[in-house]
Amino acid sequence: YHGCPSECTCSRASQVECTGARIVAVPTPLPWNAMSLQILNTHITELNESPFLNISALIALRIEKNELSRITPGAFRNLGSLRYLSLANNKLQVLPIGLFQGLDSLESLLLSSNQLLQIQPAHFSQCSNLKELQLHGNHLEYIPDGAFDHLVGLTKLNLGKNSLTHISPRVFQHLGNLQVLRLYENRLTDIPMGTFDGLVNLQELALQQNQIGLLSPGLFHNNHNLQRLYLSNNHISQLPPSVFMQLPQLNRLTLFGNSLKELSPGIFGPMPNLRELWLYDNHISSLPDNVFSNLRQLQVLILSRNQISFISPGAFNGLTELRELSLHTNALQDLDGNVFRMLANLQNISLQNNRLRQLPGNIFANVNGLMAIQLQNNQLENLPLGIFDHLGKLCELRLYDNPWRCDSDILPLRNWLLLNQPRLGTDTVPVCFSPANVRGQSLIIINVNVAVPSVHVPEVPSYPETPWYPDTPSYPDTTSVSSTTELTSPVEDYTDLTTIQVTDDRSVWGMTQAQSG
């Protein structure tokens, strides 16, 4: 194929791939008609003047995962047709000025995972057609004003995983076409008002894993097209009342892993497209009425691993579409009987790892579609008569690790559990805590006559019999309902995630804890 170097493979489609540790310089001669050239995993340490001079038809050039630390300014001369250039995963510390001069067709420039210490306005001043610029995974400490001023067509800019401590409010001002801006995993402590004002077409803004403490009230007010906003794993302690007020297109918002202490009513919204809200790992202590009332389409609300001790009866007003509610690992001792009344479509509720000592009899009264209830690891001694009777779709109920009091008052619950054993699962059953002479015995098979009789003997001898429903999938063939949505934290599609399996009260629904927001 017009001559293919021995250390490369060349395909009929004008694609050349050169790989291997034995390669220490750009192989020659390269086929003059090559349109795609990949130089991967070699020991090339530098690019000299014009190594690609005879392949002017080249459209895509990938020089990745090499030992490349030095590039001569004229290395890419004569590549006027080049649209895609990747120098990712090398050892570049410095970019020579003028390196990209003459690359008039360049649309994608990938410089990620190098050791770049700085960028200057002159670096990209010739790249007026650039649409994508990847600079993540370098050692950048600041971005000078004007660095991106000539990139007016840029739609995607990734500055994640650097060492940025501050951002100038002017640095993005000319990027009116930008759709994706990623600043995750830096050291940003605050973002000046006006920083994002020019980004009127922005759809995704990734700010997770920084050290942001405060958000300016109008920080996102010009970003009406924003769909995905990642603010997780920062130090945000409060949300200004209007900060999310003008984000009607938002469909993903992550705020987990911050220091939020309270949420004021109406803070979220209106956001008619928001389907999931992740607020776990904060310091929220209470939920006031109507705090989520603008989120009419919300389906998943994760409030686990906070310090919530009080939920106002109207806290979940408006959440008529909610399917999953996670409140586990909080400090709840009591729940108002009406707190879940508006959640007509709720399927999964996790209340484990709280301090609940009793539940109102009507707590699940209007939530007829519940399929999974997690109540393990609370301080429940008994449950009200008939609390689960109307839950025909219930197929997972976790009641273990509670101090069940096995006197005669427990009989109605015991009888109901006996008839509905499959719903409890087979791994861990609830056991009696008191009286001491029956401690540790299964609540389901306990002989209550052995226990100390209660002073109060209920008039109704047992729960109404609700064994199995025709519309309920047989157990255990069905996959546990609560192990669907909340198995992983929200994962962005652009970050390599390290997942850590957590199995105690620090997990989120028994979530794997993803590092990205």
Epitope: A331, Q333, D334, Q352, N353, R355, R357, Q358, Q376, N377, Q379, Y400, D401, P403, T428, V429, P430, V431, F433, S434, P435, A436, R439, G440, Q441, D504, D505
Partner: antibody, heavy 120, light 112 residues
Framework: EVQLVESGGGLVQPGGSLRLSCAVS????????VHWVRQATGKGLEWLGV???????NYNSALMSRLTISKENAKSSVYLQMNSLRAGDTAMYYC??????????????WGQGTTVTVSS | DIVMTQSPDSLAVSLGERATINCKSS????????????LAWYQQKPGQSPKLLIY???TRESGVPDRFSGSGSGTDFTLTISSLQAEDVAVYYC????????FGGGTKVEIK
């Protein structure tokens, strides 16, 4: 007879980790919870966490990121794993359970403790 | 976290006399529905492991002598030893379990 016996203490380097064991007899771990409590010399008691009969765990919030409590029911053993140790973790470490008390978080049977010293 | 503050730090009482130890919590330990105060008292003698004396603020653990009594509600609690015996020399700790347990700093009781 109910017994709890701690082991695994000793000298640990700062920044290192420890894994303490609590071997129980006279009762089953599938029926009773086991707590871990520590006490620095001449100081007060500090609750570290608990693993309940069904395997759920609760932790002291100040230490949660460094602690893991686990158990093997068949071996009648409970474990305390603690990472990133510092001098302030030097203490006697006890395991305890609620054998007859009506108090769910009460601890009426204790081991004799195992001493952990964090020093270089 | 709930902070438990004990007073006094130490107490010297003659044999047969009354000893009173106070414990104050940073928030109420009373659950209005169960009507229980989630406070316990422990005794720790020199060189020994702690021993549970009283739970729910005033319920004596099985086998504990009736000279030990607990009282109080909400945030203020008291352990009283009505007639101090030589074997009562120890450090006494209060502990809340309204939230995840925290202990008071301890009160050392000695014979005068």
């Amino acid at each position: 007879e109910v017994q709890l016996v701690e082991s695994g203490g000793g000298l640990v380097q700062p920044g290192g980790s420890l894994r303490l064991s609590c071997a129980v007899s006279g009762f089953s771990l599938t029926s009773y919870g086991v707590h871990w409590v520590r006490q620095a010399t001449g100081k007060g008691l500090e609750w570290l966490g608990v693993i309940w009969a069904g395997g759920s765990t609760n932790y002291n919030s100040a230490l949660m990121s460094r602690l893991t409590i686990s158990k093997e029911n068949a071996k009648s053993s409970v474990y305390l794993q603690m990472n990133s140790l510092r001098a302030g973790d030097t203490a006697m470490y006890y395991c305890a359970t609620h054998m007859i008390t009506e108090d769910y978080y009460g601890m009426d049977y204790w081991g004799q403790g195992t001493t952990v010293t964090v020093s270089s | 976290d709930i902070v438990m503050t004990q007073s006094p730090d130490s107490l010297a009482v003659s044999l047969g006399e009354r000893a009173t130890i106070n414990c104050k919590s940073s928030q109420s330990l009373l659950n209005s529905r169960t009507r229980k105060n989630y406070l316990a008292w422990y005794q720790q003698k020199p060189g020994q492991s702690p021993k549970l004396l009283i739970y729910w603020a005033s319920t004596r653990e099985s086998g504990v002598p009736d000279r030990f009594s607990g009282s109080g509600s909400g945030t203020d609690f008291t352990l009283t030893i009505s007639s101090l015996q030589a074997e009562d020399v120890a450090v006494y700790y209060c502990k809340q379990s309204y939230n995840h347990p925290t202990f008071g700093g301890g009160t050392k009781v000695e014979i005068k």
